[in-house]
Each structure stands twice: as C-alpha cells, then as structure tokens.
Interface confidence: low
C-alpha cells in the first residue's frame, strides 16, 4: 500500500484513479470500513465518519477518473489506512500525520535551550533531522534539543521527518533574543563625547521591559548602576540616572547612550542588561571604554590609556615627519626632553590604529641670565 505523510494543521490529498477516464461510483472509507465520502449520481455524499466535515473531493477531476480525497486541518488522530473503492477494486493509502512544535515560546533568549517535540501516530518510528539557519544540524526521535541557542540560530529552522522512506518538511521560525554584539569597545580621547549603541539582533512588534547599565570603572573598587530605564512598546523612558556621569539616553530603539565626556575615571567596562516582559532571563551586552590622554609636563611628554586593553596592543609616541618613535606594549609611554613639533600618540593593534591623539611640543628657550 501507498504511504503518505501529512503535517498537523495542513491539507493532504489522497489520490485514487480509475482505469477509465470517466465519472464512476467511488467511496472512501477508513480502516473500520466507515464511509467518509463518495459519489451518488453526480453528487458528493458524506458518511458518518468524524472526518467527513473536513473531507472533500475535486469534482472537476471526476470525469478524468481521478477520485481524490482532500483532508483539511489534519490531526494526528487522522493517521489511518484509507480505502478507495472504485471499479470493484480497492486502493489502500496509509496516512501518517506528524506535528512538530517548540515546547516553549519560539522567542528565546541567547543561551536558553530550544526543545522541539514530535507528535506522531502510535506505532510509527520516525526520525527527525533539523537544520538551523546557520547550518547547524541536530537529529533525534520524539524530541530534539538545542542546549544553548546562539545569535546565528535566529531564523527559519528546516526539519525533515522521515518514515518508511517518505519525508515531510516542517519550517519553524525561531527568534533568538540577543544584542547584535556580545561585546564592543569604544576608544576615545579624553574630553570627547562617547556614544554607546546596543542594537538588538531581532525585531519584535512590541518590545516592553526594563534595563540597567552597570559600570565597573578601572579606578573604582566596586561597580555602580549608571542608568535604569523602561522600554514600553519600543519607546525608552529613563527611570534613574547617576549624577556623575550624567548619561543621556535616546528615546527610540536601538538603545543609545551618550556620555558627555570621556574621562580617565570613567574608563572601564559596563554590562547592559535588558529584561523583557514575560521572559525569564536577560539580554546582556558588554561595553568597554578606553580613554587616552597625552600631556606635556616640564621636560616629560606622556601618553597614557585607561580601560580594558589587551596586552598585545601597542602604545606609541611618534614625532610627525621624523623617524622618532617610542613604542611599548604598556598603558603608558613617555619621552624625556621631547623635540619640538607635532607628536602623535597612537594606540594600535597589529598596525591598525584604534586611537590617536595629537599634542604640540613647543621649543623651550633657555632662560636668559639676569645681570
């Protein structure tokens, strides 16, 4: 007998063909011999089966000898062997209906687990294989689990259910709630305005929740809440903000914070958390601030950086148009009795300049001796 796989909630067409291409008597019955539908004269008649109100046939194809049965809004319990009786012959079709659903909401936070459950008819032994938008493959039987969702798992998952060499494909849309970047670093000269942006890696029609930015300054012994805010339908309203520094926050998404000026005492790292309404857990994004200061004091030209820098970063003092350079893999570099001219302080990573500050050194004239 022929095996047909169907999807819960979908429509399936079970075909039955007569050898003569003409309108003739036919019946569809279930395995208990209960009539579902058939033909009487040129009218479609329905039997006492509980499936009858969801069953139909393509009348336009009857005179071509095609007597298909269409079942709408498939249910797992529709799985059965269906018999088409036409021209004194019987054609059997085994219908197996499967359902694949996510155990929880399909909007999940990064790091949470996704469990997919397969509903299947008794006696079947299907296998399931799912492919994430990023190409990750998982397979299993009745349940499939993705223990820790990542940003790249957002999108349409394609799952193939196989049974008796037949397959049926399910599409499940998964939204991983996360920020676009796990971490970002802003490099600024002392006194410059600092912009922090936290774009989400998802779009939701309504976005409601509350958030907070905790800041650990390099110079401070403990972290401090810099700002708390509410999010109501994608509009941001500040609840509380520290007096020093006085952050400003944009009223629309993406979340946008402005620090009036970069100062060594603010250099450090922060953690922005966003708790969304009706979700357990929080979205996190780390943000780092590196501040540079170049100063000349008496005969000493110094360049310093504060904040989380990696040991492989190079700090250099360079005299413009001259070969004079002092470089160190350290947080401070200095030159004693620097030559006059425009000096550049550079923070670089493998030759790529991350931050640059210029300072002009004026020639020092010897003080005239008083007579």
């Amino acid at each position: 007998k022929k095996v047909v796989l169907g999807k819960k909630g979908d429509t399936v067409e079970l075909t039955c063909n007569a050898s003569q291409k003409k309108n003739t008597q036919f019946h569809w019955k279930n395995s208990n011999q209960i009539k579902i539908l058939g033909i009487q004269g040129s009218f479609l008649t329905k039997g006492p089966s509980k499936l009858s109100d969801r069953a139909d046939s393509r009348k336009s194809l009857w005179d071509q000898g095609c007597f298909s049965m269409i079942i709408k809004n498939l249910k797992i319990e529709d799985s059965d062997t269906y018999i088409c009786e036409v021209e004194n012959k019987k054609e059997e079709v085994e219908l197996l209906v499967f359902g694949l659903t996510a155990n929880s909401d399909t909007h999940l936070l990064e790091g949470q687990s996704l469990t997919l459950t397969l509903e299947s008819p008794p006696g079947s032994s299907p296998s399931v294989k799912c492919r994430s938008p990023g190409g990750k493959n998982i397979q299993g039987g009745r349940t499939l689990s993705v223990p820790q969702l990542e940003r790249q798992d957002s999108g349409t998952w394609t799952c193939t259910v196989s049974q008796d060499q037949k397959t049926v494909e399910f599409k499940i849309d998964i939204v991983v709630l996360a920020f676009q970047k796990a971490s970002s670093t802003v490099y600024k000269k002392e006194g410059e305005q600092v912009e922090f942006s936290f774009p989400p890696a998802f779009t939701l029609e309504k976005l409601t929740g509350s958030g907070e930015l905790w800041w650990q300054a390099e110079r401070a012994s403990s972290s401090k809440s810099w700002i708390t805010f509410d999010l109501k339908n994608k509009e941001v309203s500040v609840k509380r903000v520290t007096q020093d520094p006085k952050l400003q926050m944009g009223k629309k998404l993406p979340l946008h914070l402005t620090l009036p000026q970069a100062l060594p005492q603010y250099a450090g790292s922060g953690n922005l958390t966003l708790a969304l309404e009706a979700k357990t857990g929080k979205l996190h994004q780390e943000v780092n601030l590196v501040v540079m200061r170049a100063t000349q004091f008496q005969e000493n030209l110094t360049c310093e950086v504060w904040g989380p820098t990696s040991p492989k970063l190079t700090l250099s003092l360079k005299l413009e148009n001259k070969g004079t350079t002092v470089s160190k893999q350290a947080k401070a570099v200095w030159v004693l009795n620097p030559e006059a001219g425009m000096w550049q302080c550079l923070l670089s990573d493998s030759g790529q300049v991350l931050l640059e500050s210029n300072i002009k050194v004026v020639p020092t004239w010897p003080t005239p001796v008083q007579p």
């Epitope: 409601t208 907070e212 509009e235 357990t280």
Partner: antibody
Framework: QVQLVQSGAEVKKPGASVKVSCKAS????????ISWVRQAPGQGLEWMGE????????YYNEKFKGRVTMTRDTSTSTVYMELSSLRSEDTAVYYC???????????WGQGTLVTVSS | DIVMTQSPDSLAVSLGERATINCKAS??????????MNWYQQKPGQPPKLLIY???NLESGVPDRFSGSGSGTDFTLTISSLQAEDVAVYYC?????????FGGGTKVEIK
C-alpha cells in the same frame, strides 16, 4: 504559588530604628522588583522605595531618603527594609509588594505593624 | 510627584446596584497609547488586592463586574452590580512616574 511573608509586629521608641523582613517564595527571587508601601492607621497608601534583588540596587522615595535602607539576601530570598530616626507619624502597617510589569503591585505581603510610641 | 485625587470619599450603594468611583491625576498618566492607572481593593486587616491595571485590564481571577475606564487624567472604576463581598476601600494608583502614587481611597458600603 507566589508568597511574600513578613516579620512580626514591632513596638519602637522615637529615635530608634526598625528592620522589617519579607521572605519571597514561589518564583525566581532575582527576577522581580520588590517595593515597600506603608499605610498609617486609617490612612492611604504610600510608596517608600524599591529594590532590585538581582543587583541589590535600591531606589527610594525622596520623602524617605536618608532614613530608609533596603537590602536583600539572595541566599534566603529575603528583602529587608530598615527605617531609622523613627517618629510617632511612622506608626503604620508596612507592606512589601512584588511588581508585575512596571510599578503595579500584584503580590503583597501580609503587612507588619510598626508602632512608634514613647 | 503626580497627585491622585479620588471621589467620593465614601459611597453607599444598594445590593445589585452600580457603584462608580472617580480618580483624577494632577497630570496625564498616558504613555504611548496606554494609561498607566491601576485600581486596588482593600478589605479590613488585609493587604490591597490588584483589580485593574493599565486603566481597563482585569487582573486574573477578578470578577467581571469590575471594570475600569478613562485616559489622560480622568479615570473611573465601576462595579456593575454590587455584592456584599465588595464592601471595601478602593484605591487608584498611577504607575507612569516614580514615585508611584495612590489616591486617598473610597469606602464602599451597602445602603
């Protein structure tokens, strides 16, 4: 089910301090803000402040700043509210309440009566 | 702070009759299409109980004879058919701005 259980009634002298506890159960303690609301005898309701149990950060009504301190102990899922420099007008029932979305109070403790009398 | 003014202070209504309580905010409590107004019921010796949130949403488990309406600065709590168990003090509360503030309360009794 969500439960907030508060400590028993207290009688204090003017100038003293009182510390009221609120033990939470039936939900993830660190996930919801706990507010303190008081009600003087025969009077209305007054919000005193709130604490974020996850971070421990707390925010107070200007009226009580300098006199109120809210703390939490995550190991016991308990929030504390301490009010100092008590005066007779601080005689009230003090409630802890768990917020739902925003500052609407869905779950309440049974209340703690604090009497300030010389 | 937003000041909430309730009226009347007390109200006597016959069983099965309609009870209406008003609440006026000193400034609008609307934000992005929603009105951040909540209503509570308090019976003697008990903590308040949330009835209505965001002006008109019925809290789970609250009988549907309670309803809320209004926007901006003017809000109303209605009990369509007063029952004996509805005897209590009712408070309005705004949750738009810190600090959250409550109305002075309306005592509902049976006539």
């Amino acid at each position: 089910q969500v439960q907030l259980v508060q400590s028993g009634a207290e009688v204090k002298k003017p100038g003293a301090s009182v510390k009221v506890s609120c033990k939470a159960s039936g939900y993830t303690f660190t996930a919801y803000v706990i507010s303190w609301v008081r009600q003087a005898p025969g009077q209305g309701l007054e919000w005193m402040g709130e604490i974020y149990p996850g971070s421990g950060s707390s925010y107070y009504n200007e009226k009580f700043k300098g006199r109120v301190t809210m703390t939490r102990d995550t190991s016991t899922s308990t929030v504390y509210m301490e009010l100092s420099s008590l005066r007779s007008e601080d005689t009230a029932v003090y409630y802890c309440a768990r917020s739902g979305d925003g500052s609407r109070f869905v779950y309440w403790g049974q209340g703690t009566l604090v009497t300030v009398s010389s | 702070d937003i000041v909430m003014t309730q009226s009347p202070d007390s109200l006597a209504v016959s069983l099965g009759e309609r009870a209406t309580i008003n609440c006026k905010a000193s400034q609008s409590v609307d934000y992005d299409g929603d009105s951040y107004m909540n209503w509570y019921q308090q019976k003697p010796g008990q903590p308040p109980k949330l009835l209505i949130y965001v002006a008109s949403n019925l809290e789970s488990g609250v009988p549907d004879r309670f309803s809320g309406s209004g926007s901006g600065t003017d809000f109303t709590l209605t009990i369509s058919s007063l029952q004996a168990e509805d005897v209590a003090v009712y408070y309005c509360q705004q949750s738009l701005q810190d600090p959250p503030t409550f109305g002075g309360g309306t005592k509902v009794e049976i006539k």
